[in-house]
């Protein structure tokens, strides 16, 4: 048993048929001595009394909350959940795996830039009766300091009959050094809290493998005289580092014509113009990525060649 | 060529070559999630490579101020990596043909310490640890996380040569 | 894109040879090895051996030497794999493959194969 | 030689259901193993190198596990369109070898 926050205990618990479970001893939070009371959750049934309650967690209908009482008064309150572990690995049964880019990964991960500025979040198919917290540091063993908001319900989509809830969160590092070379990677911790049911969830990364940057901005076609080339321009995000002659991108620019059938014409350049062929109903698109290190491609910006 | 004393390099050549550099070792591991290199084993293997950290002056400012060490802690990383791409870890099993990146990777790191360090003057370069991985599976774990660790060096090195060439060339 | 176009089927007589050939596009030829393989009929793949069209180096299974020949010609873009001697069990589709850009040989691209009929 | 051992060398399952292939190097290959699909009378496929990855535009039934000896082909969900031959090979050392064959029907 460990306290996960002040009056809330998390038990551990070795889950299969007719396992033991683990013996808790409670101690009433006060300078009384006698006439001490415990009770479970709304019932009045009287569990035990004196200043300390041993009782045998096996299963969810032992966690809850744990009050002590003398003489109807309220004295203190432990709220006790259960993290179950079932054949040596801890249950993921509160976030949904998201199998992307492997699997068992329910936290992804993305920064817009190097600044040291990331955003996780996580699916649930959970409606109701969750709470999340979030901790993050870089390395584990001498941790340095990252700051992380309130995970906060970010989008809802229905998925056939299920509907599916996304959480995230924002996470700043608090003396984030964009130029250098990372050796120690961020490290993520989200506590998932679901009615009496407790799991936790890591990430590691280094913050160059999650750089996914907002797709290029002022994407403008030119028509060249006499031709059916036009020259493409557009310009680096807003939400890049800078200065970009250090941070350099690298941009794709594709034409495509309306049939997703139709064969796609592909450029890739460092530079902010292109000159390409702008074919009859066909779109051109932009997406740009680290020049220099192959993270995320952005999405793509799009404008049509008429 | 960068010249004992702190003359500049030959911006424009280094950026080239620098960018090559982060091509080739992207080529010769181009996987990102195929398996947590940071979940295995061999911990202290990867673990004195040379870093560009925070305090190397290899930021914009920094290399405006005195680009002299920032240079220094790359061409120390060059030197490095050269050598292990030259060591057993990298012949042996699992084979690797003769088309492999690595070749030219090796070559190319070389090419461009030369470019950063005149023959006859000699910034001091860090020790190699010595390491014979016995096992196929061992010395494949090596290979991923150097070359893993080589991907992250090299972009901070381009990034350098590149941000020199535009601002701080002649 | 990368392309891999194998010259037709052949049929032999014992103690012949044959040249299969192996046409490649879409890349630049020198930068890879070209791989051979054999399938005989209802069997698994057996690896042959590789060129190496930029130092023109080939690379053989043990058990095929003396047996192939495998060349490139750098003008044409073309590989050639020579089975000399030829017996019934040499019956076999051939394919000729590349591999991986990252130097390990896993293939990525292959040829369409060529059956060589071997009989009396 | 490094001998690759695959098992079984038929197989017959239903639409839907989870399928497994074996492959047993006779020594150590690191994860230095691909999977091929051939269907009939065409050219082999990659689907999964480095023993668990998966090639581009291989759908996620497909997945790979294991290293040094011991390998996995997994079909989680059989599809009419997986009916083929499939192959492990390994490519740590010369010469390099593949499995027998694993011819998958639908039942």
């Known amino acids: 048993i460990w306290e996960l926050k002040k009056d809330v205990y998390v038990v551990e618990l070795d889950w299969y048929p007719d396992a033991p479970g683990e013996m808790v001893v409670l101690t009433c939070d006060t300078p009384e001595e006698d006439g001490i009371t415990w009770t479970l959750d709304q019932s009045s049934e009287v569990l035990g009394s004196g200043k300390t309650l041993t009782i045998q967690v096996k299963e969810f209908g032992d966690a809850g909350q744990y009050t002590c009482h003398k003489g109807g008064e309220v004295l203190s309150h432990s709220l006790l959940l259960l993290h179950k572990k079932e054949d040596g690995i801890w249950s993921t049964d509160i976030l949904k795996d998201q199998k992307e880019p492997k699997n068992k990964t329910f936290l992804r991960c993305e920064a817009k830039n190097y600044s040291g500025r990331f955003t996780c979040w996580w699916l649930t198919t959970i409606s109701t009766d969750l709470t999340f917290s979030v901790k993050s540091s870089r390395g584990s063993s001498d941790p340095q300091g990252v700051t992380c908001g309130a995970a906060t319900l970010s989008a809802e989509r229905v998925r056939g009959d299920n509907k599916e809830y996304e959480y995230s969160v924002e996470c700043q590092e608090d003396s984030a050094c964009p130029a250098a070379e990372e050796s120690l990677p961020i490290e993520v911790m989200v506590d998932a809290v679901h009615k009496l049911k407790y799991e936790n969830y890591t990430s590691s990364f280094f913050i160059r493998d999650i750089i996914k940057p907002d797709p290029p901005k002022n994407l403008q076609l030119k028509p060249l005289k006499n031709s059916r080339q036009v020259e493409v321009s557009w310009e680096y995000p807003d939400t890049w580092s800078t200065p970009h002659s250090y941070f350099s991108l690298t941009f794709c620019v594709q034409v495509q014509g309306k049939s997703k059938r139709e064969k796609k014409d592909r450029v890739f350049t460092d530079k902010t113009s292109a000159t390409v062929i702008c074919r009859k109903n066909a779109s051109i698109s932009v997406r740009a990525q680290d020049r220099y290190y192959s993270s995320s491609w952005s999405e793509w910006a799009s404008v049509p060649c008429s | 060529r960068a010249v004992p004393g702190g003359s500049s390099p030959a911006w424009t050549q280094c950026q080239q070559l620098s960018q090559k550099l982060c091509t080739l070792a992207w080529s010769a591991h181009p996987l990102v999630g195929h398996m947590d290199l940071r979940e295995e084993g061999d911990e202290e293997t990867t673990n004195d490579v040379p870093h560009i950290q925070c305090g190397d002056g290899c930021d914009p400012q920094g290399l405006r101020d005195n680009s002299q060490f920032c240079l220094q802690r790359i061409h120390q990383g060059l030197i490095f990596y050269e050598k292990l791409l030259g060591s057993d870890i990298f012949t042996g099993e699992p084979s690797l043909l003769p088309d492999s990146p690595v070749g030219q990777l090796h070559a190319s790191l070389l090419g461009l310490s030369q470019l950063l360090q005149p023959e006859g003057h000699h910034w001091e370069t860090q020790q190699i640890p010595s390491l014979s991985p016995s096992q196929p599976w061992q010395r494949l774990l090596l290979r991923f996380k150097i070359l893993r660790s080589l991907q992250a060096f090299v972009a901070v090195a381009a990034r350098v040569f590149a941000h020199g060439a535009a601002t701080l060339s002649p | 894109q990368v392309q891999l176009v194998q010259s037709g089927a052949e049929v032999k007589k014992p103690g012949s040879s044959v040249k299969v050939s192996c046409k490649a596009s879409?890349?630049?030829?020198?930068?890879?090895?070209i791989h051979w393989m054999r399938q005989a009929p209802g069997q698994g793949l057996e690896w042959i051996g590789y060129?190496?069209?930029?130092?023109?180096?080939?690379k053989y299974n043990e058990n095929f030497k003396g047996k192939v020949t495998i060349t490139a010609d750098k003008s044409t873009s073309t590989a050639y794999m020579e089975l000399s001697s030829l017996r019934s069990e040499d019956t076999a589709v051939y394919y000729c493959?590349?591999?991986?850009?990252?130097?390990?040989?896993?293939?990525?691209?292959w040829g369409q194969g060529t059956l060589v009929t071997v009989s009396s | 030689d490094i001998q690759m051992t695959q098992s079984p060398s038929s197989l017959s399952a239903s639409v839907g259901d989870r399928v497994t292939i074996t492959c047993k190097a006779s020594r150590d290959v690191a994860i230095a193993v691909a999977w091929y699909q051939q269907k009939p009378g065409k050219v082999p496929k990659l689907l999964i190198y480095w023993a668990s990855t998966r090639h581009t535009g291989v759908p996620s039934r497909f997945s790979g596990s294991g290293s040094r000896t011991d390998f996995t082909l997994t079909i989680s969900s059989l599809q009419p369109e997986d009916v083929a031959d499939y192959f492990c090979?390994?490519?740590?050392?010369?010469?390099?070898?593949f499995g027998s064959g694993t011819k998958l029907e639908i039942k």
């Open positions: 060129i190496y069209p930029r130092d023109d180096s080939p």
């Open positions: 879409g890349y630049t030829f020198t930068d890879q090895t």
């Open positions: 090979h390994q490519y740590s050392s010369y010469p390099f070898t």
């Open positions: 493959a590349i591999p991986d850009r990252s130097g390990y040989a896993f293939f990525i691209y």
